[in-house]
């Protein structure tokens, strides 16, 4: 009996036309939502004038439906048993699941000012930037609508910066009508233990953002894993959002709509400093902000963001060192709300429920030559927003899963 089941599972998790896995893989049957909480700065003037702690108040959720578009350019390669595809991006605002509208205003760090002052360190260029910042009536902080902040706005300061500069700024700009990839993953035809594992991303096996093993593209995209998952496994996956591969470890058994699943979580060790976790040495890319690689819980992804000083962390600086959150007031990290988990059905390796949580931060530094940054006496890693991307298998799909997979085994 067991062998027959194994044989059936192996057949059905292959990523090719006609299998259960393929149908759900091309277009997810799960509704996926991305909730945003924006950190509204309460004391912009005091920060700019006196280098005070930044007081933030999170506002949200503002919810978008995402991942509703089918994979594009799906191409099988029989020679190396891979399938390549593009994952199109799309977001639809869901007013009924949100606390306000896309027109709500927020006081946030001026993204262009922070980024430009970081990219251009030369004092004479900074004098020019200062001139253009003042001329455009820009400041250290700005008021922007949710729509502007997420999806893009024409920045008045960047509009004065001479060629060739993208004058549109947004945390997720450009998003709609773009696609992530090309991904090339193993289809599992020759070896089921490799199914869904990424072979190449954008035509390469490495990212070119990090040194050594940190630069590797490991595992799957976390939507599924090779079948027959064991609790002892460390599940590797790649997330283009954070420009790196990461891993999850088993935490607990969970019953999801009558389906036994394994809950895998991203452990705090994955965010530790190299002092605590030597494997992380290659994620420490500079010595000053990281305090000689002793800070932890924030990832400098500037190399992946055209030099813009973007730092990724867990929401509310969960698992981050005290020095990171010290200049920010109003944060309340807690594991239940702010960690990432994947609920995986172990027989098929399918992720039936997940919560991906991350926070987008921007570094801003004092600058003698830029008036609006002149009074700062320290560096700030400023939280802009955090997001919670969730998906849960629907009731109908869960019934089908119970009857066709777990029911047959029990």
């Amino acid at each position: 009996g067991d062998l027959l089941i194994q044989k059936t599972i192996k057949k059905q998790v292959v990523l090719e036309e006609g299998t259960i896995a393929f149908k759900n893989w091309v277009k997810t049957g799960t509704e996926v939502y991305r909730q945003f909480w924006i950190f509204d700065v309460q004391n912009p003037q005091e920060v700019m004038m006196n280098s005070s702690n930044i007081q933030v108040k999170q506002r949200g959720p503002y919810t978008y439906r995402v991942r509703f578009l089918a994979k594009e350019n799906v191409t099988q390669d029989a020679e190396d048993n891979t399938v390549s595809f593009l994952q199109p991006n799309g977001a639809i605002f869901e007013p009924s699941l949100s606390v306000g509208t896309e027109a709500d205003n927020f006081t946030v760090l001026n993204l262009a000012v922070a980024a430009a002052s970081h990219i251009y360190q030369n004092q004479f260029v900074q004098m020019i930037l200062n001139s253009l910042i003042n001329k455009s009536k820009s400041s250290m902080f700005q008021v922007r609508t949710l729509r502007e902040l997420l999806w893009g706005y024409r920045d008045p300061f960047l509009s004065l910066v001479p060629y060739p500069v993208t004058t549109t700024v947004g945390l997720f700009y450009p998003y709609n009508n773009t696609a992530d990839g090309v991904y090339k993953v193993f289809n599992g035809k020759d070896n089921i233990s490799k199914v869904a594992i990424i072979d190449t991303y954008k035509g390469k096996r490495n990212l070119s953002y990090w040194e050594s093993h940190c630069d590797m593209i490991n595992g799957t995209d976390a939507a599924s894993f090779p079948p027959f998952v064991e609790k002892s496994q460390v599940l590797q996956f790649f997330s283009s959002d954070i420009c790196r591969s990461i891993y999850a470890v088993f935490e607990s058994d969970v019953n999801l709509k009558g389906i036994p699943v394994y809950r895998f979580v991203l452990p705090s060790k994955a965010f530790a400093s190299p002092v605590e976790n030597p494997d992380n040495y290659c994620f420490c890319t500079e010595k000053i902000i990281s305090k000689n690689c002793t800070s932890y819980g924030v990832l400098d992804i500037s190399k992946c963001k055209e030099g813009r000083p973007v730092y990724i962390s867990l929401p509310h600086f969960l698992y981050a060192s005290p020095d990171v959150s010290e200049p920010i007031d109003g944060l309340n990290p807690n594991e239940e709300e702010h960690r990432t988990y994947l609920d995986i059905e172990p027989i098929t390796g399918f992720t039936l429920q997940f919560a991906k949580r991350l926070q987008v931060n921007l570094l801003v530094k004092p600058s003698e030559k830029i008036q609006v940054l002149k009074n700062l006496k320290r560096n700030y890693i400023v939280p802009i927003l955090w997001l919670n991307e969730t998906g849960t298998i629907g009731d109908e799909k869960a019934n089908m899963f119970r009857s066709q997979v777990t029911g047959k085994i029990n």
Partner: nanobody, 118 residues
């Protein structure tokens, strides 16, 4: 290669005028912001005037506002600084500079000396 050549400096009495010119070559002039900096004796170099690309937004140091005017001629690849009501504190070496977003630091000319003295 990139060249910026300043001219028009000299000795002038307080209250007098001078027009500095900067001839550019070796780069696509019209896509660069052009600036004049100056370095008074024993002091740091400072930004005096700036003119951006098309649209020609201009900006000036507070100390020269209303007295100095920057202008550019993209066809001739020149940038000029008209200096009126000159004061002794305007004495400095004046440098022409070109910058755009692809550069981490600006291009510089050799500088021209301006001395305001009676």
């Amino acid at each position: 290669q990139v060249q910026l050549q300043e001219s028009g400096g000299g000795l002038v009495q307080p209250g007098g005028s001078l027009r500095l010119s900067c001839a550019a070559s070796g780069f696509s002039f019209s896509t660069y912001a052009m600036s004049w900096y100056r370095q008074p004796p024993g002091k740091e170099r400072e930004l005096v005037a700036l003119i951006t690309t098309t649209g020609g937004t201009t900006d000036y140091a507070d100390s020269v506002k209303g007295r100095f005017t920057i202008s550019r001629d993209d066809a001739e690849k020149t940038v000029s600084l008209q200096m009126n009501s000159l004061k002794p504190e305007d004495t400095a070496v004046y440098y022409c500079s070109a910058w755009r977003a692809t550069l981490l630091k600006p291009y510089w000319g050799q500088g021209t000396q301006v001395t305001v003295s009676s």
